[in-house]
Interface confidence: medium
């Protein structure tokens, strides 16, 4: 004799009893009415299962909750199924067996026929696991059922602090969707909140799970696929205050079927969004967007933000949204990088884009901007990176495209190519009134518009000029004069420089900022406009430093231990971290602080010039870093503002030194012998380079490095030209992760050292 191998299969679900009604007492597990009714309903469920062929496998069951409408019973039951039959008893098959029994004319005296009028249509059976039951049981001491009426915003009572886990069981009208809003009220906690597309905490129906007081998403809204949701809270550490506020609404299903015809222009024409964006998209999302282009000269570009698409094997589900575009199946995934999907138009002038959630697990709503591109020249003057669909500068010495193809097959890299014989000359020699090319082609077209390219400056009227770095040089190079606008910047207040010294003089670096918390210098920064200071994003990554309210910004400061008449201080009204900032890699390490009132410029307080995206800082150029950082690795911060000259290092060499961890948003400076470098406390401070015009331009922000001043390891700075578009967007009110959104890891509170 050999014992038959069985496996415990757990099913969860609900059924409606048409001849009973929900009462408030049934919503409270501790009430006598609940205990009595749940025992009877559990017996009814047991009898129902037992009267089918599943009866021989029956192990146990429980009715753990009741809901509104005709009385809805929420239950689970366990069957011990022979191993060989496991796959044949799917939730669908089990439901069918139970529905057949409910519809049968058998003359049983079981309560599901005599006492309870069970609605076969309303029977829901879902697959569950033993672990789901364990989680459910752990919440039963703090189990809250709420029915959400339409038009009502229902605040949910906070978790019971005596328990370690609570469950909110939410139900609304059948034709509506449940939408939960979660707002973290504290900056640090270790609580976990999980939301399920079911009445109970079924792992296979998990929509999202968040841990800790999430600074990435201080407020989040989450949609269920229908009228039921479960929210489970697990305590992280003891606290007298609720770490979050929960509220819930029942909302109508929003359609996302769109037909659009685009106009024959190349700028952004609109956006497509998942329903209730920026809410998490629902597990039942199915969007179909049909876009028509005006002619086959154009292709369609979809511009994503922190989300990208990639091909996936057909047998693999997309976990963050499935996209069908021109019969291509693509999976979405979250990324801290920009991405564009380019759709070439070949035979038809229309394309249908389908977005579907394939699993219950969802994510933040997806928004995609759309525009047209010229199919014959998708990236005028630049290189189309096929990996991410972006137009990137070509042959500038920086591998912008992950596969490096933008720097392949270059006749001249980070240099000007003479038209006569393809000789390469350095960029500062272009349009300098001295011919260097054989026939002087480097000095031609210097007074007129030229096709835009990697090193051409784009004027406000979108025309381009050949002269490198024409901004604020005292000569009007653009027809519209835009290269000489916004030039109240980059001039030193006083020129008494200590030659070869390390201590700065008053007014020498009038843009230098000291960012402080409770009188302690934490990071450097630079004034870039009358209400804006730029710094490094990693200065704010500690939970205790994330709030703008904590910070004071000092400008015109010389010494940390004393105040003098030339210095002014400001509170911070808003903090913007770059939305792609990633602490582990230090990528996009830039933040903007909006000051509480405008700065009045003086000899000791004035902004540095911001470079254009095309501004070329030449490797080998001597530039300066300033700050109150430590004067030796591990040492204390300096009292007096220090300055040090460093040389800009070619990207390829720096990248090799740091084993290819240097991204295109990074710039290296220093010396191979080390000695001169930034250090702790300098983070976010300016790396500035002086142009021949005498104006100082912001090339970088102190970001990270291996140690301080170590041989073979340069200082790594945020490359301002690669984040300038985001800076301008924030300065002109275009937003970009305001209020302090960031992510959770550890950087040193200032210059990053390993």
């Amino acid at each position: 004799y050999k014992a038959e191998v069985t496996v415990s299969q757990v099913y969860s679900g609900s059924l409606r009893v048409l001849n009973r009604h929900f009462s408030q007492d049934l919503g409270r597990r501790e009430s006598i009415a609940f205990r009595s009714e749940s025992a009877k309903a559990q017996k009814m469920l047991q009898e129902l299962v037992a009267s089918t062929r599943l009866g021989t496998y029956y192990n146990s069951s429980s009715v753990y909750s009741f809901g509104e409408g005709p009385l809805t019973c929420f239950f689970w039951f366990i069957l011990d199924i022979p191993e060989y039959q496991r796959l044949t008893l799917s939730p669908e098959v089990v439901r069918e067996l139970l529905v057949d029994e409910l519809l049968s004319n058998s003359s049983t005296l079981a309560s599901y026929k005599t006492e309870y009028e069970v609605d076969p249509e309303g029977l829901v059976i879902l697959e569950a696991s033993v672990n789901d039951i364990v989680v459910l049981n752990s919440t039963l001491g703090c189990y809250r059922y709420s029915y959400v009426n339409p038009g009502q915003v229902l605040p949910l009572k906070g978790p019971d602090q005596q328990t370690t886990s609570c469950l909110w069981h939410l139900q609304g009208p059948e034709d509506l969707m449940i939408k939960v809003r979660l707002e973290w009220t504290r900056v640090d906690c270790r609580d976990r909140v999980a939301m399920y597309d079911a009445a109970g905490p079924l792992e296979k129906r998990l929509i999202t799970s968040v841990y800790g007081c999430s600074r990435q998403e201080p407020v989040m809204e989450v949609l269920a696929s229908g009228s039921v949701m479960a929210v489970v809270w697990k305590k992280g550490m003891h606290s007298y205050y609720d770490p979050f506020l929960l509220s819930v609404k029942s909302v109508a299903f929003q359609d996302c079927q769109v037909n659009l015809t685009l106009e024959g222009r190349l700028d952004t024409q609109g956006f497509l969004r998942t329903p209730y964006y920026p809410s998490y998209y629902s597990p039942s999302t199915h969007c179909s967007w049909h876009l028509t282009v005006p002619s086959l000269d154009y292709g369609l570009a979809l511009w994503f933000d922190a989300y990208a698409l990639r091909r996936q094997k057909y047998n693999r589900l997309c976990t963050q949204g499935q996209w069908m575009i021109q019969n291509r199946r693509l999976c979405g995934f979250r990324t801290l990088q920009p991405y564009a999907e380019r759709i070439p138009m070949v035979a038809s002038d229309g394309v249908t884009i389908n977005f579907t959630s394939q699993i219950s697990l969802t994510g933040p709503g997806v928004q995609v901007y759309y525009s047209l591109y010229n199919q014959s020249d998708p990236c005028p003057g630049e290189f189309l990176c096929s990996v991410n669909g972006l137009c990137v500068p070509a042959c500038d010495g920086i591998k912008d495209c992950p596969n490096g193809l933008d720097e392949r097959n270059c006749v001249c890299r980070a240099m000007f190519q003479c038209q006569e014989d393809s000789t390469c000359i350095s960029l500062p020699r272009v349009c300098d009134r001295q011919p260097d090319c054989l026939n002087g082609s480097d000095e031609e077209q210097c007074q007129e518009g030229v096709p835009c390219g990697t090193f051409t400056f784009q004027c406000e009227d979108r025309s381009c000029v050949k002269k490198p770095n024409p901004e604020c040089d005292g000569q009007s190079d653009c027809r519209d004069g835009s290269d000489e606008q916004h030039c109240d910047c980059g001039l030193q207040g006083l020129s008494s420089r200590i030659v070869g010294g390390t201590v700065s003089s008053e007014g020498e670096w009038p843009w230098q900022a000291s960012l402080q918390i409770r009188g302690r210098h934490i990071c450097g920064g630079a004034l870039i406009a009358d209400r804006w200071v730029i710094t490094a994003a990693h200065c704010f990554q500690e939970d205790s430093m994330a709030s703008p309210k904590l910070w004071t910004v000092f400008l015109g400061k010389m010494r940390q231990n004393s105040r003098w008449p030339g210095e002014v201080s400001f509170k911070v009204s808003r903090l913007f971290l770059h939305p792609y900032h990633e602490e582990d890699s230090h990528d996009y390490d830039v933040a903007l602080l909006q000051l509480d009132h405008p700065v009045v410029y003086s000899a000791t307080v004035r902004p540095v010039c911001l470079p254009a995206r095309s501004h070329f800082f030449e490797p080998g150029q001597h530039c300066w870093i300033t700050g109150w950082g430590a004067q030796r690795e591990g040492g204390p911060v300096s009292n007096t503002l220090q300055k040090v000259d460093v040389q800009l290092v070619p990207q390829d060499l720096c990248s090799e030194a740091y084993r290819y961890q240097v991204s295109p948003r990074m710039l290296c400076a220093g010396y191979r012998k080390g000695k001169k470098d930034a250090c702790q406390g300098d983070s976010g401070g300016p790396l500035v380079c002086r142009e021949p015009s005498g104006r100082w331009f912001l090339a970088g922000l102190v970001s990270w490095g291996l140690g301080c001043g170590r041989p073979n390891f340069f200082g790594v700075y945020t490359r301002v030209t690669r984040v300038i578009n985001w800076i301008q967007q924030v300065l002109t009110g275009g937003g970009g992760s305001g209020g302090g959104g960031s992510h959770h890891h550890h950087h040193h509170g200032s210059h990053h050292h390993h």
């Epitope: 097959n409 390829d652 060499l653 191979r672 340069f714």
Partner: antibody
Framework: EVQLVESGGGLIQAGRSLRLSCAAS????????IYWVRQIPGKGLEWISS????????AYADSVKGRFTISRDNAKNALYLQMNSLRAEDTALYYC?????????????????WGQGTTVTVSS | QSALTQPPSASGSPGQSVTLSCTGT?????????VSWYLQHPGKAPKLMIY???KRPSGVPDRFSGSKSANTASLTVSGLQAEDEADYYC??????????FGGGTKVTVLG
């Protein structure tokens, strides 16, 4: 006067080992990358190895990798090349050369001071 | 790493110009701006004439100039003089701290 002087060359049987030395003077030795370059008589130059000033970055040409070892002693202003498993094709004039002076790049990958060379003849 | 390609010989009369080529790949000459040129007289050690494509060390006459286009670097010697007769070698950085040399060009000053 800035100077590099190689020594240690000679006639050696294939399969045997030899150690070349390079003595530096007239400059701050520990601030420079140093290279070994060889030249087969009547033929071109071949870079074979380089070592950074702190000995933390070392590189070899594929033709000698696993057989030759470069090292330096900054206290003695000396560079060494340990050559094992010598082959007939290693016969050449061996130069040591200094990285171009300057305090900026990781390397310039350019050699501004050369020794006069030491001859290694490997007999088979 | 394979050697850079240089023509075996080149010649010119005194006062004339001669241009020497050095062809590599997109992984060395084509990728990095670290091309050097050396002059070597018979029985002597090489002498650095050009580094980083076009820069001259102090003491090198401005008759020597370097340039680069795609995978090919060039050295131009203008106003050719008798003492310019020598072997000329190019070199390039090839990534991963490796350097590669060319096979050399023998320059003859005619007359």
């Amino acid at each position: 006067e800035v100077q590099l002087v190689e020594s240690g060359g000679g006639l050696i049987q294939a399969g045997r080992s030899l150690r070349l030395s390079c003595a530096a003077s007239g400059f701050t030795f520990d601030e420079h990358v140093i290279y070994w370059v060889r030249q087969i008589p009547g033929k071109g130059l071949e870079w074979i190895s380089s070592i950074s000033w702190k000995s933390d970055i070392i590189a070899y040409a594929d033709s000698v990798k696993g057989r030759f070892t470069i090292s330096r002693d900054n206290a003695k202003n000396a560079l060494y090349l340990q050559m094992n498993s010598l082959r007939a094709e290693d016969t050449a004039l061996y130069y040591c050369a200094r990285e171009k002076d300057g305090d900026f790049y990781y390397y310039y990958f350019a050699m501004d001071v050369w020794g006069q060379g030491t001859t290694v003849t490997v007999s088979s | 790493q394979s050697a850079l390609t240089q023509p075996p010989s080149a010649s010119g009369s005194p006062g004339q110009s001669v241009t020497l080529s050095c062809t590599g790949t997109s992984s060395d000459v084509g990728y990095y701006n670290y091309v050097s040129w050396y002059l070597q007289h018979p029985g002597k050690a090489p002498k650095l004439m050009i580094y980083e494509v076009s820069k001259r060390p102090s003491g090198v006459p401005d008759r020597f100039s370097g340039s680069k286009s795609a995978n090919t670097a060039s050295l131009t010697v203008s106003g050719l003089q008798a003492e310019d007769e020598a072997d000329y070698y190019c070199s390039s950085y090839a990534g991963s701290n490796k350097v590669v040399f060319g096979g050399g060009t023998k320059v003859t000053v005619l007359g």
